[in-house]
């Protein structure tokens, strides 16, 4: 299996950004997707049957989706850093993808460079 992510992305301070991962090249069943921040704190969990769980610190500015992705709103400079999606699958096990988000002071158009993690 392969995780494809939105790669390195930029977004404006005060704006919002969509963090997206996609698992391909496997027939494994996705049981859960975990979203974690650069300091290894948890943002959200998406359980395949029950749906979303949002970590308390992010309840006011994280919107689940689209899909298995996550929308982070009201961005601050402190949001700059790595984000990880962890796919828990059966029977394959765990797949992990990385996204780097840069929050910019000035108005810069979002840039998305897609890359793959085998």
């Amino acid at each position: 299996g392969t995780i494809e992510t939105t790669g390195n992305i930029s977004a404006k301070k005060g704006g919002s950004v969509i963090l997206q991962c996609h698992l391909s090249s496997t027939m494994a069943q996705v049981t859960q997707v975990n979203w974690e921040q650069h300091d290894h704190s948890l943002l959200a969990i998406r359980n395949a049957e029950l749906g979303w769980h949002i970590y308390p610190a992010f309840k006011d500015r994280v919107a689940p989706g689209p899909g298995l992705g996550l929308t982070l709103q009201s961005l601050t400079m402190n949001d700059t850093g790595e984000y990880f999606c962890t796919y828990h699958t059966y029977p394959d096990g765990t797949y992990r993808g990385r996204i780097f988000l840069e929050v910019l002071e000035s108005s810069v158009a979002e840039h998305s460079a897609r890359f793959q993690i085998p």
Epitope: Q32, N34, H40, S41, L42, I45, N47, E49, L50, G51, W52, H53, I54, P56, K59, D60, R61, V62, A63, P64, G65, T71, Q73, H88
Partner: antibody, heavy 127, light 106 residues
Framework: EVQLQESGPGLVKPSQSLSLTCSVT????????WGWIRKFPGNKMEWMGF???????SYNPSLKSRISITRDTSKNQFFLQLHSVTTDDTATYSC?????????????????????WGPGTMVTVSS | DIQMTQSPSLLSASVGDRVTLNCKAS??????LAWYQQKLGEAPKFLIY???SLQTGIPSRFSGSGSGTDFTLTISGLQPEDVATYFC????????FGGGTKVELK
């Protein structure tokens, strides 16, 4: 105050089905997430499954082939059925609520913990 | 499955003592941990969520700490009404419970 109360037969024969009812007052089962948990002799506890505010279900993989959780919103009750029971299913069965949180996108999300429980009902599987 | 191990299984203490109960996860669960109190013949009572957040209405002598794999429930100043079994539960991946710690008075 949310209250839950389990009811059902205390004795079930091996190979038969165990059927329990959880009656809820103080909260609508059409909101939040509602679960069944059992405690075996010796204190080991096991999450069995949930029924959600929308009526969809999630089951412990170890029980998936034998378990069914349903509900009756008009009576504010939800139900557990466990098929083909053995003596290993002897336990105290409890129902509980897992609260929800409404997100920015008006989506109901689960909180993970159980904030209200029933007192539990002891079920013995024996011939 | 994530295994949750509680220690000790039995704890004897005196009224007023500071009591510490431990819960260990078999892998990191971040702070996705809850604590419950169950008295004999009663429904479990929800005490703490996210490892250290006290549920509304729970006395402040109860506190939780920890993250990752090691967690602690502390009762600072044990009261007679605190005699009960305490158990932890993770909700990082599925839902699993510890075996419980029974707290009794010396």
């Amino acid at each position: 105050e949310v209250q839950l109360q389990e009811s059902g037969p205390g004795l079930v024969k091996p190979s038969q089905s165990l059927s329990l009812t959880c009656s809820v007052t103080g909260s609508s089962i059409a909101s939040d997430y509602w679960g069944w948990i059992r405690k075996f002799p010796g204190n080991k506890m096991e999450w069995m499954g949930f029924i959600t505010y929308s009526g969809s279900t999630s089951y412990n993989p170890s029980l998936k082939s034998r378990i069914s959780i349903t509900r009756d919103t008009s009576k504010n009750q939800f139900f557990l059925q466990l098929h083909s029971v053995t003596t290993d299913d002897t336990a105290t069965y409890s129902c509980a609520r897992m609260p929800s949180f409404i997100t920015l996108a008006s989506l109901s999300t689960w909180e993970g913990y159980f904030d209200f429980w029933g007192p539990g009902t002891m079920v013995t599987v024996s011939s | 499955d994530i295994q949750m191990t509680q220690s000790p299984s039995l704890l004897s203490a005196s009224v007023g003592d500071r009591v510490t109960l431990n819960c260990k996860a078999s892998q990191s669960i971040h702070k996705n941990l809850a604590w419950y109190q169950q008295k004999l013949g009663e429904a479990p009572k929800f005490l703490i969520y996210y490892a250290n957040s006290l549920q509304t209405g729970i006395p402040s002598r109860f506190s939780g700490s920890g993250s990752g794999t090691d967690f602690t429930l502390t009762i600072s100043g044990l009261q007679p009404e605190d005699v009960a079994t305490y158990f932890c539960q993770q909700y990082y991946s599925g839902w699993t419970f510890g075996g419980g710690t029974k707290v009794e008075l010396k």
